[in-house]
Interface confidence: medium
Amino acid sequence: KSSNEATNITPKHNMKAFLDELKAENIKKFLYNFTQIPHLAGTEQNFQLAKQIQSQWKEFGLDSVELAHYDVLLSYPNKTHPNYISIINEDGNEIFNTSLFEPPPPGYENVSDIVPPFSAFSPQGMPEGDLVYVNYARTEDFFKLERDMKINCSGKIVIARYGKVFRGNKVKNAQLAGAKGVILYSDPADYFAPGVKSYPDGWNLPGGGVQRGNILNLNGAGDPLTPGYPANEYAYRRGIAEAVGLPSIPVHPIGYYDAQKLLEKMGGSAPPDSSWRGSLKVPYNVGPGFTGNFSTQKVKMHIHSTNEVTRIYNVIGTLRGAVEPDRYVILGGHRDSWVFGGIDPQSGAAVVHEIVRSFGTLKKEGWRPRRTILFASWDAEEFGLLGSTEWAEENSRLLQERGVAYINADSSIEGNYTLRVDCTPLMYSLVHNLTKELKSPDEGFEGKSLYESWTKKSPSPEFSGMPRISKLGSGNDFEVFFQRLGIASGRARYTKNWETNKFSGYPLYHSVYETYELVEKFYDPMFKYHLTVAQVRGGMVFELANSIVLPFDCRDYAVVLRKYADKIYSISMKHPQEMKTYSVSFDSLFSAVKNFTEIASKFSERLQDFDKSNPIVLRMMNDQLMFLERAFIDPLGLPDRPFYRHVIYAPSSHNKYAGESFPGIYDALFDIESKVDPSKAWGEVKRQIYVAAFTVQAAAETLSEVA
């Protein structure tokens, strides 16, 4: 029986019924409930929340809701031996110490188990030495220091400002530069928007606020001790020395009050240009070491955190499909937070909760989706996407055969200006069509569609009259589904105005001040932006699970493949002489893209014309659409990154948060002029072009007529 026969309701009515059932007031209530105490991964509080969500999803009407547990490597500060940084004089006396905790926000003074700021997975150590200021600690910042300024970071403690790139990349870069410790701090230039008060009077970061976060370089591995396989009861675990992605030097985060004390004494070289200056009243000298009067003083780190194998719990809910129960559409977001999780993740978890409630209401009225919908509340995302990755490792065979799509649901807001969507090109048309049907919540756009306000506020840089949609990078739970398994994925949230607000993320990210009140007072008092995000995420899941033909347009992949090929060719053409010397040609890639474009066009024509009442042909066409994303997976993975297997997209090697197109070719070309063996380096470029061209051609052939 089809889902529509089961209810005698038209598909359009079902979608309307689903969307109409979503209520801002419920999201608000759920957010409040999820944010009253900390829910740090591996703690009893987070286990209790998992059980609460399991119970409520069952009440909402899902067919089954199970806990999936894993024993993974986590990291915690030592409760009796706190982490801090000091300035020491020549006698070794500590003349300044950084704060041991953030001053708690009003109303939370008596809350226990607030984890103090720390860099998760930092090794223990007490290095001391001269300080070097390394700006954002990006690849290009170290190039500037080492190549242009001839400053050697070897044996130094580096201080870097948060922002621009994932903190794990900063630590990796510092390690490669020979540093013996890293201090991370939030500069007001990046975390204090002009004209806004600091919390609790506004949404800016106070001087005592600190960003927590993991500093791993997992490259998609999941649990550091069980890469590739689930961390279950009978798992074989690597020794800590063989663990994946752990940093080798101590790392600690601080706020800008403490950073001021370290940076104001800096001597040595002046900053190379204005892009190295933040907003503190300090010279932003690079060092090494302190200036004149303070030249005998050093910086000392005291880090005593421990890595511990700890049990984590995912909640997995199932709403069985009526027609294609073996096809899975997944909506997942994490539950664990650093402290209260007012935005990250509970603004997302509250939206998922309301989406589950709405689907459950329809199910209780006799409706079922065409395909199975899986709902997930992931654990230990903050410790390296561990819950989602372990579950996907455990279920990889099912997922690679049955996974239609994954929609991510972390923070629903990072601002309140306009929509932000990152997704596979297969979902562009789905997102466009859906947002044309939804009302904009934005002031000045009353009665207008979400598509209209989004396009006006965030226009595509390429296509007039269309909104910007970005590439998927990483740093969130879609990673394993998209980058490793090749399941079409997308994410949506409300964002800030990127033109006027240059600060990184939102100011209170991963601090103790990320509370319910932050959201309710300053970001979304009416919860109208949360509701819109619920409609977008929920609407995408609904369409993916219920449309007779999957709402994927392969022609949009053809368009971006051409753009990405143009881009990578243009990068390579910065080296015309070497291209000639080593006979480097992109002809095979452009040819494959041309073939893909033609075959995708023909497939789309067949998709319009085929007999949709023939279930075998329908299933065949849908399978070609479902498996197209899978066809971009190279089983061997990218060089030195075996769990990043998507040939078209991978997280940037220089910033995990950003997506890179044709990453294999891009990395082979990166800084190629500095390679010791140019012949070998250009040989690798040629190999990567070959892999990319083959993959695009092979993917195209999956869309050809089957016989």
Partner: nanobody, 119 residues
Framework: QVQLQESGPGLVKPSQTLSLTCTVS??????????WSWVRQHPGKDLEWIGF???????HYNPSLKSRVIISVDTSKNQFSLKMNSVTAADTAVYYC???????????RGQGTLVTVSS
């Protein structure tokens, strides 16, 4: 750090041609993956996209302005230019040059230059 600076006359007579140049410093204009664009903002209004030139040379214009606008690039000088003919008082605005790309952090804008169309 890439910076953009607009230059050109602040006053243009009606029916004449508005000419602006954007000088890019701190990075190459032929850098792959970027779109070099012109936008304008009328007093009290939203930004209006005029057009852009993609790193591979393709040029796209706002359809409502297409008949009056030419965007060109001079890679040797690391500059790109805007010419808008048959201007009227309705073209009075602050004109900005900008760099854009596929991702959110790619957006950069110059400080803007006020162009008044008046006789």
């Amino acid at each position: 750090q890439v910076q953009l600076q607009e230059s050109g006359p602040g006053l243009v007579k009606p029916s004449q041609t508005l000419s602006l140049t954007c000088t890019v410093s701190g990075g190459s204009i032929s850098n792959s993956g970027y779109y070099w664009s012109w936008v304008r903002q009328h007093p009290g209004k939203d930004l209006e996209w005029i057009g852009f030139i993609y790193y591979n040379g393709s040029i796209h214009y706002n359809p409502s302005l297409k008949s009056r606008v030419i965007i060109s690039v001079d890679t040797s000088k690391n500059q790109f230019s805007l010419k808008m003919n048959s201007v009227t008082a309705a073209d009075t605005a602050v004109y900005y040059c900008a760099r854009d790309g596929d991702d959110y952090g790619d957006y950069l804008r110059g400080q803007g230059t006020l162009v008044t169309v008046s006789s």
